[in-house]
């Protein structure tokens, strides 16, 4: 005759408030004859959680049909879990007796603890934009989780980061905890399309971590490079000068032309294009009138990008005699 074993496979069961908890208990023998009851706690003050035959237990249901002839599964479900339900639960076999049933064997117990899911991680970047090659800080926060053990990782474009500091508060016992992590990220010129991801893994998430993201486009400023060139061809007595503003971000840009120090108000043609890396190119064309009297034209293309100090590029116009002859109306 096989000796009865009471099997409660889970030592710890984490449950969420409002959800249903399943407490497992199986027996290895049908003997001795007698009921299996569930208790919370031990000793004379233990609380009866479920008695199949009598009493009122509206929140408890059985997983299997306890009246089936060879039933060995005495697992129960407790609905609408509250913080008052935490504790260690024991399934206990009784042997029928007179006048009272006699406790025969207890399972090892399953501790029910409240698990609370962490809130969705919120990632905040720096207040001001920074240029490439500089380091910026991102913070990630998540709140309201329990138990305290939690794992937080940082990624940039799928690559795990190592330069970060994480704190979980409070350090002592609490019903819920918060995590805050600060990561230091070195900006690359191509980071306009990059993302930083904060990933939080917790036992309540059952292997499906929560993620918070921030776009580096909010944190980066890529300053433009300027190039002013004179087109070799001219139309009549006009020379076309091009100012190419390359690889800048964000889009906010003001461009002005100056001729010999005087700001030109007249309309200029321009185009804006977006590069694959998310930066922008801006091309502006300026038509300069050429005459015999104008050998010393200096053109300046000035760019004010994203509220920063203006940068400019100058071009001294090269008007050759040959060009002047070409543009002259007089015949020799």
């Amino acid at each position: 005759e096989e000796e009865l074993q009471m099997i409660q496979p889970e030592k710890l069961l984490l449950v969420t408030v409002g959800k249903t908890a399943t407490l497992h208990c199986t027996v290895t023998s049908l003997l001795p004859v007698g009921p299996v009851l569930w208790f919370r706690g031990v000793g004379p003050g233990r609380e009866l959680i479920y008695n199949q035959k009598e009493g009122h237990f509206p929140r408890v249901t059985t997983v299997s049909d306890l009246t089936k002839r060879n039933n060995m599964d005495f697992s129960i479900r407790i609905s609408s879990i509250t913080p008052a339900d935490v504790g260690t639960y024991y399934c206990v076999k009784f042997r029928k007796g007179s006048p009272e049933n006699v406790e025969f064997k207890s399972g090892p117990g399953t501790e029910m603890a409240l698990g609370a899911k962490p809130s969705a991680p919120v990632v905040l970047g720096p207040a001001a934009r920074t240029t490439p090659e500089h380091t910026v800080s991102f913070t990630c926060e998540s709140h309201g989780f329990s138990p305290r053990d939690i794992t937080l990782k940082w990624f940039k474009n799928g690559n795990e980061l190592s330069d970060f500091q994480t704190n979980v508060d409070p350090t002592g016992q609490s019903v819920a905890y918060s995590i805050r992590s600060t990561a230091r990220v070195v900006l690359d010129p191509w980071d306009v399309r990059s993302q930083v991801i904060c990933e939080v893994a917790h036992v309540t998430l059952q292997g499906d971590p929560l993620r918070g993201t921030a776009n580096l486009s909010e944190a980066i400023r890529v300053p433009p490079t300027l190039e002013v060139t004179q087109q070799p061809m001219r139309v009549g007595n006009q020379v076309n000068v091009t100012c190419q503003v390359r690889k800048f971000y964000p889009q906010s840009l003001q461009l002005t032309w100056s001729e010999n120090g005087n700001v030109c108000q007249r309309e200029t043609a321009s185009t804006l294009t977006e590069n694959k890396d998310g930066t922008y190119n801006w091309t502006s064309w300026f038509l300069v009138n050429i005459s015999d009297q104008r050998d010393d034209v200096v053109l300046t293309c000035q760019v004010k990008h994203d509220g920063q100090l203006a940068v400019s590029k100058r071009l001294a116009l090269e008007v050759t005699v040959h060009q002047k002859d070409q543009s002259s109306d007089a015949t020799p």
């Epitope: 233990r46 009866l48 306890l66």
Partner: antibody, heavy 113, light 108 residues
Framework: EVQLVQSGAEVKKPGATVKISCKVS????????MHWVQQAPGKGLEWIGR????????KYAPKFQGRVTITADTSTDTAYMELSSLRSEDTAVYYC??????WGQGTLVTVSS | EIVLTQSPATLSLSPGERATLSCSAS???????LYWYQQKPGQAPKLWIY???NLASGIPARFSGSGSGTDYTLTISSLEPEDFAVYYC?????????FGQGTKLEIK
């Protein structure tokens, strides 16, 4: 819906035996203990005993031991309480209840010569 | 056997007042096994409070139960006309199961 329907009122002579039935519906009688409770006129509740219909195991209060027999027929989902050697003080309403939570409507037994 | 003694035997109060009904056990009863029933004339008892402090389905929140060991209490915070009835405490901690003699809550 859980229901416990008891048999009708009985008038018995002292020394006689009465057998009251309690027909249940909405659940399987084998799943629960069936209890019987006495209430004499103008008095409180007194537990008589109970049966486990699954295996017919019974427990009785010492006051009723020897005079009471509780049985159950699982094929008809009916519990019975039989009280013998009736005396006038047995005049009471008798209730069946399922596992202490759901009660029948009561059966009045009058013992009178 | 465990003897349950309820006090007072009769409690005369007016609607709106607070009612406190006591149940004292001759030996310790686990709180899981202490129930209260309400009974009105000509009706079967109804389960009112189970496991010392849990209200049965549909029971108003003005009712509450408390206690441990040998002393248990049913409290009604503000009496409503429909609350006037007889209340019984009941233990099923050990055989034979026993009831208190009841407290009759009557309108003053």
């Amino acid at each position: 819906e859980v229901q416990l329907v008891q048999s009708g009122a009985e008038v018995k002579k002292p020394g006689a035996t009465v057998k009251i039935s309690c027909k249940v519906s909405g659940f399987n009688i084998k799943d629960y203990y069936m209890h019987w409770v006495q209430q004499a006129p103008g008095k409180g509740l007194e537990w008589i005993g109970r049966i486990d219909p699954e295996d017919a195991e019974t427990k009785y209060a010492p006051k009723f031991q020897g005079r009471v027999t509780i049985t159950a027929d699982t094929s008809t989902d009916t519990a019975y309480m039989e009280l013998s050697s009736l005396r006038s003080e047995d005049t009471a309403v008798y209730y069946c209840d399922r596992g202490l939570a759901y009660w029948g409507q009561g059966t009045l037994v009058t013992v009178s010569s | 056997e465990i003897v349950l003694t309820q006090s007072p035997a009769t409690l005369s109060l007016s609607p709106g007042e607070r009612a406190t009904l006591s149940c004292s056990a001759s030996s310790s009863v686990s709180s899981s096994y202490l129930y209260w029933y309400q009974q009105k004339p000509g009706q079967a008892p109804k389960l009112w409070i189970y496991s010392t402090s849990n209200l049965a389905s549909g029971i108003p929140a003005r009712f509450s139960g408390s206690g441990s060991g040998t002393d248990y209490t049913l409290t009604i915070s503000s009496l409503e006309p429909e609350d006037f009835a007889v209340y019984y405490c009941h233990q099923w901690s050990s055989y034979p199961y026993t009831f208190g003699q009841g407290t009759k809550l009557e309108i003053k």
